[in-house]
Interface confidence: medium
């Protein structure tokens, strides 16, 4: 069957059940339900999934059976709306159930919560986990899907199946090992970190589609796929972009069965046509489905064709530029973006999109001018400052990172961003600045040619986290402006923000700076977060504090924690020394 060309099916639910198989069907329905009803207990979701699965089986047996012709949204929405505690648990989300499809599904989507009020996932002892895994492997793995999906309501569902497969493999291997913990814990840490990164990347794709539309996503995809597959023809890249857009539109829209099915079809198509796409796909295409799709999504850029001619001939010097542009603007701009991106794997996708936007704006203006060619002849000169800006920023920040190390680099960013947008909640500032700071260890090790795509595209993902968290409870007009005006200019917009002079400093509250002996038992990461939380609060109290003042206070704070954690009577030390520290800090900062 051709990619996405399906015969009309009498029963959509039967069709997807047959395509995906029972195991994937059940897993995807569980993910979908957990992403919609994020507060519901695990057992309730399992019950709903089992009911849907039994119903799907009746439709497989007889596609003409009652209700089998209903859309998946209707079937799933009806099922979600049977939850007895909907009003008490979710408040106004219960009003969604009074709506008809497709409005009901849109309503559920709008109530997805990027920061749900759920307890932090605490990792049990290894023996406890291994016992649970052996006692009931199926329930153990379902619980993993459920816990990740409800905390990450936009997690890319087919990719979550891949994570679950790796999660299972880790327990299968390590629960038999001599040193279970040494085997298992690093694997779980890796899955956790990769999972958070995967969630954040997908969140940006969904934000791109939902806030800026399909055209914005397609432009991003043209640029990225052209960098990755520079030997593929423009028509081939366009085909992949169209299909990839469909896949992500479905997943971001909660259509997880269709999304997973279409992603599998796309992987199949890519592997069947790898000769005309990329020489780097061979290994990926030998893997099983979930691994194959993941591998394709992460595959390295193919080598650029050796004999690519100058871009200027077709896009500046040709007398047909305005004619070609007028005939089909998006196709012509798509060709420009394709040609530019395949020549520049060293540029970030967002930079390529800024260049394409500049080119488009120039043609809009010049093709209406008396002498179009004279008007657009120097368009490529306008690209120079756009290219240099991220290059310089990355150079400066990598130098700072190499000088300070990750923790202190994060602190520098915490201070910088708190001064820019002090109204943002402290937990959000800490989370976002810590992630921004990770760009150093992630990207600064790369050679020049790989730094910009690594750094700027990663920063786009992190700043999107700030945007989605801020959208839930907007407190800063400056954040709203940078987040909503232009997807590709978010990072330059935030970079350009200076200290917010309109901010009225927060009242000093000694309680914020009171610490207890429990800090001593925290992991190094948790201890860092405590210190960084205090740093943000300091800046909110004293936005005009100098680097030197803040450094002195933070050094005193670190010494205070170290001293009291070594004391015999830790709690007394924290109480007495803490008062002295607060007083000294107030004096140092002039509070």
């Amino acid at each position: 069957r051709g990619v996405f060309r399906r015969d009309a099916h009498k029963s959509e639910v039967a069709h997807r059940f047959k395509d995906l198989g029972e195991e994937n069907f059940k897993a995807l329905v569980l993910i979908a339900f957990a992403q919609y009803l994020q507060q519901c207990p695990f057992e309730d979701h399992v019950k709903l999934v089992n009911e849907v699965t039994e119903f799907a089986k009746t439709c497989v047996a007889d596609e003409s059976a009652e209700n089998c012709d209903k859309s998946l949204h209707t079937l799933f929405g009806d099922k979600l709306c049977t939850v007895a505690t909907l009003r008490e648990t979710y408040g106004e989300m219960a009003d969604c159930c009074a709506k008809q499809e497709p409005e009901r599904n849109e309503c559920f989507l709008q109530h997805k919560d990027d920061n749900p009020n759920l307890p932090r996932l605490v990792r049990p002892e290894v023996d406890v986990m291994c016992t649970a895994f052996h006692d009931n492997e199926e329930t153990f793995l379902k619980k993993y899907l459920y816990e990740i999906a409800r905390r990450h309501p936009y997690f890319y569902a087919p990719e979550l199946l891949f994570f679950a497969k790796r999660y299972k493999a880790a327990f299968t291997e390590c629960c038999q090992a001599a040193d279970k913990a040494a085997c298992l814990l690093p694997k779980l840490d890796e899955l956790r970190d990769e999972g958070k990164a995967s969630s954040a990347k997908q969140r940006l794709k969904c934000a791109s589609l939902q806030k800026f539309g399909e055209r914005a996503f397609k432009a991003w995809a043209v640029a990225r796929l052209s960098q990755r597959f520079p030997k593929a023809e423009f028509a081939e890249v366009s085909k992949l972009v169209t299909d990839l857009t469909k896949v992500h539109t479905e997943c971001c829209h909660g259509d997880l069965l269709e999304c997973a099915d279409d992603r599998a079809d796309l992987a199949k198509y890519i592997c069947e046509n790898q000769d005309s796409i990329s020489s780097k796909l061979k290994e990926c295409c030998e893997k099983p489905l979930l691994e194959k799709s993941h591998c394709i999504a992460e595959v390295e850029n193919d080598e650029m064709p050796a004999d690519l001619p100058s871009l200027a001939a077709d896009f500046v010097e040709s007398k047909d530029v305005c004619k070609n542009y007028a005939e089909a603007k998006d196709v012509f701009l798509g060709m420009f973006l394709y040609e530019y991106a395949r020549r520049h794997p060293d540029y970030s996708v967002v930079l390529l999109l800024r260049l394409a936007k500049t080119y488009e704006t120039t043609l809009e203006k010049c093709c209406a001018a008396a002498d179009p060619h004279e008007c657009y002849a120097k368009v490529f000169d306008e690209f120079k400052p756009l290219v240099e800006e991220p290059q310089n920023l990355i150079k400066q920040n990598c130098e700072l990172f190499e000088q300070l190390g990750e923790y202190k680099f994060q602190n520098a960013l915490l201070v910088r961003y708190t001064k820019k947008v002090p109204q943002v909640s402290t937990p959000t500032l800490v989370e976002v600045s810590r992630n921004l700071g990770k760009v150093g260890s992630k990207c600064c090790k790369h050679p020049e040619a790989k730094r910009m795509p690594c750094a700027e595209d990663y920063l786009s993902v992190v700043l999107n986290q700030l945007c989605v968290l801020h959208e839930k409870t907007p407190v800063s007009d400056r954040v709203t402006k940078c987040c909503t005006e232009s997807l590709v200019n978010r990072r330059p917009c935030f970079s350009a923000l200076e200290v917010d002079e309109t901010y009225v400093p927060k009242e000093f509250n000694a309680e914020t700076f009171t610490f207890h002996a429990d800090i001593c038992t925290l992991s190094e990461k948790e201890r860092q977060i405590k210190k960084q939380t205090a740093l943000v609060e300091l800046v909110k109290h004293k936005p005009k504090a100098t680097k030197e003042q803040l450094k002195a206070v933070m050094d005193d704070f670190a010494a205070f924690v170290e001293k009291c954690c070594k004391a015999d009577d830790k709690e007394t030390c924290f109480a007495e020394e803490g008062k002295k520290l607060v007083a000294a800090s107030q004096a140092a900062l002039g509070l």
Epitope: F4, R5, F234, A235, K239, T242, D314, N324
Partner: nanobody, 119 residues
């Protein structure tokens, strides 16, 4: 040797329909993206529509969107253009061509078929 042979043109009244065909040989049709271009009397070339080797996606010039439909039958090595709601400004010689590998240069095209829209 690459050959592209267009047919189906003719005289039609405004608002009428025509279906153009293009028989291809001499290259692997089912791995080639194809397009229709046209040239009105005394004017330059204008591209009309593109179709990927698999049949999707398809692209249309703004001037024909919603009226023309491009399709292909890979088993017959044939490209089609269904033209509805024809207008006088659609009068042109229509050529089928193999889509360019990258730049705006078309690799191969046929002799063309004339479409005249007039009352």
């Amino acid at each position: 040797e690459v050959q592209l042979l267009e047919s189906g043109g003719g005289l039609v009244q405004p608002g009428g329909s025509l279906r153009l065909s293009c028989a291809a040989s001499g290259f692997t049709f089912d791995t080639s993206s194809m397009l229709w271009v046209r040239q009105a009397p005394g004017k330059g070339l204008e591209w009309v529509s593109v179709i990927h080797q698999s049949g999707t996606p398809t692209y249309y010039a703004d001037s024909v969107k919603g009226r023309f439909t491009i399709s292909r039958d890979n088993s017959k090595n044939t490209l089609y253009l269904q033209m509805n709601s024809l207008r006088a400004e659609d009068t042109a010689t229509y050529y089928c061509a193999k889509f360019p590998s990258s730049r705006m240069k078309f690799d191969y095209w046929g002799q063309g078929t004339l479409v005249t829209v007039s009352s």
